[in-house]
């Protein structure tokens, strides 16, 4: 029942995370404009993966795509990867994952295949918020190194009356989305692979020898039973796979003012 | 067609308010900005602040701070502006102004004149 | 506040000649995230309101005649009036759109000579 719930809370868990993926690689909002010296703005500039937008005082906002490939930054470029790396993973992990869940009967899918399951797609979710957590906090950190230079270009060349205001750009909201949901799937994957340890106990693999006469020499492989005893095929009911073994009556079935492009 | 209608003259005496209104049609009304601008007779354009009719939301210059207050009604389309503890120099030319692409006022009320006078 | 200075005061041209209107401003108007420059220009005939010719520096608003067009960018700005007609006779001014507060230039009376 515990590895039940565990799968399964894993399972929402990284769909909410790469839901929250989807949604940070999506928003616009990756860097917002510096308000700190001017909170008021007439003029209010943000930039995404995919375009930078400024959204006037008057209510219009106007959105335009970077449609370069080659004149992108490298790190953006990274930043675009990682994200998509991270969806295309979680997206496979939580496919993987529908299959591998315990309250869900597909065929005669044995338990050993589950367990399995269960753990490659708690790997995918790991990598997953790893990919995501690692596009953000890329991003994050040029935002930071950006910041801090156009802070130096602030107080230099100011000779005369005239004063060239460059724009800073800070934290937007997608990188807080980015990490959170990033946190989100690798903790569901992490719970997975929990979950997974659960649907394959190791002490089956002692209790299969106790069948056997006594003065029989058996070769125990550490593996698991997958190597022939000598004893022909095994017992109906168990399925005995590599890490552990798990009986059929054990199983349990559950039923967006004025925007333009 | 877009029309920003004013209200009438009004005649008041130092420390006193007025309050000043603007009334919208032709246009979706919460869709845009409202502006208020006032031009001192003989002198130059001044912009006091503005009103999203949508949020509420407002943004006033600096210096008429506290004394300047925008708000709507949105059941008849029309912004208020009253400008408190009245001085001489108040005297103006108050105008509404919807704003448009780039932040530019593209369409203006008539004006209201407001005489302040002991 | 980005203070806007606008010269000539005032400007007498002849009808069918060139007029031209500078704009200076404090700080530069230029919005780094779509490379507009915030600046409007505005006409103004005695006892009416001001009447919106030109936004964004350049881009003239529909319905305004094509002799008048607007030039510069960053914190020098320019209104052209390429054949000067009766109908112009003005107070011409130029404001920031860019930062709060938004301020106007002191205007330019445009004049037949």
């Known amino acids: 029942m515990a590895v039940t719930a565990c799968q399964g809370l894993g399972f929402v868990v990284s769909l909410i995370g790469i839901a929250g993926i989807i949604a940070a690689t999506c928003m616009d909002q990756w860097s917002t404009q510096d308000l700190y010296n001017n909170p008021v703005t007439a003029v209010f500039n943000y930039q995404g993966l995919w375009r930078s937008c400024v959204r006037e005082s008057s209510g219009f906002t106007e959105c335009r795509g970077y449609f370069t490939l080659l004149g992108l930054p490298a790190m953006l470029q990274a930043v675009r990867a990682l994200m998509i790396v991270g969806i295309v993973l979680g997206a496979i992990g939580l496919l993987v994952s529908i299959f591998a869940l315990k309250c869900i009967r597909i065929g005669s899918m044995e338990d050993s295949a589950k367990a399995n399951m269960t753990l490659t797609s708690g790997i995918m979710f790991i990598v997953s918020g790893l990919c995501a957590i690692a596009g953000v906090s890329v991003f994050a950190n040029m935002l930071v190194t950006n910041f801090w230079m156009s802070t130096a270009n602030m107080y230099t060349g100011m000779g005369g009356m005239v004063q060239t205001v460059q724009t800073r750009y800070t934290f937007g909201a997608a990188l807080f989305v980015g990490w959170v949901a990033g946190g989100l799937t690798l903790i569901g994957g992490v719970m997975m692979c929990i979950a997974c340890r659960g649907l394959a106990p190791e002490e089956t693999n002692y209790k299969a020898v106790s069948y056997h006469a006594s003065g029989h020499s058996v070769a125990y492989k550490p593996g698991g039973f997958k190597a022939s005893t000598g004893f022909g095929s095994n017992t109906k009911n168990k399925k005995i796979y590599d890490g552990g073994a798990r009986t059929e009556d054990e199983v349990q079935s559950y039923p967006s003012k004025h925007d333009y492009v | 067609q877009v029309q920003l209608v004013q209200s009438g003259a009004e005649v008041k005496k130092p420390g006193a308010s007025v309050k000043v209104s603007c009334k919208a049609s032709g246009y979706t009304f919460t869709g845009y900005n409202m502006n208020w601008v006032r031009q001192a007779p003989g002198q130059g354009l001044e912009w006091m602040g503005n009103i999203d009719p949508y949020y509420g939301g407002t943004s006033y210059n600096q210096k008429f701070k506290g004394r300047v207050t925008m708000t709507i009604d949105k059941s008849t389309s029309t912004v208020y502006m009253e400008l408190s503890s009245l001085r001489s120099e108040d005297t103006a030319v108050y105008y509404c102004?919807?704003?448009?692409?780039?932040?530019?006022?593209?369409?203006w009320g008539q004006g209201t004149t407001v005489t302040v006078s002991s | 506040d980005i203070v806007m200075t606008q010269s000539p005061d005032s400007l007498a041209v002849s009808l069918g000649e060139r007029a031209t209107i500078n704009c200076k401003s404090s700080?530069?108007?230029?919005?780094?995230?779509?490379?507009?420059?915030?600046l409007t220009w505005y006409q103004q005939k005695p006892g009416q309101p001001p009447k919106l010719l030109i936004y964004w520096a350049s881009t003239r608003k529909s319905g305004v005649p094509d002799r008048f067009s607007g030039s510069g960018s960053g914190t020098d700005f320019t209104l052209t009036i390429s054949s000067l007609q009766a109908e112009d006779v003005a107070v011409y001014y130029c404001q920031n759109d860019y930062s709060y507060p938004l301020t106007f230039g002191g205007g330019t009376k445009v004049e037949i000579k």
């Open positions: 102004a919807r704003m448009y692409h780039g932040n530019a006022f593209d369409y």
């Open positions: 700080q530069s108007l230029l919005n780094s995230g779509n490379l507009k420059n915030y």
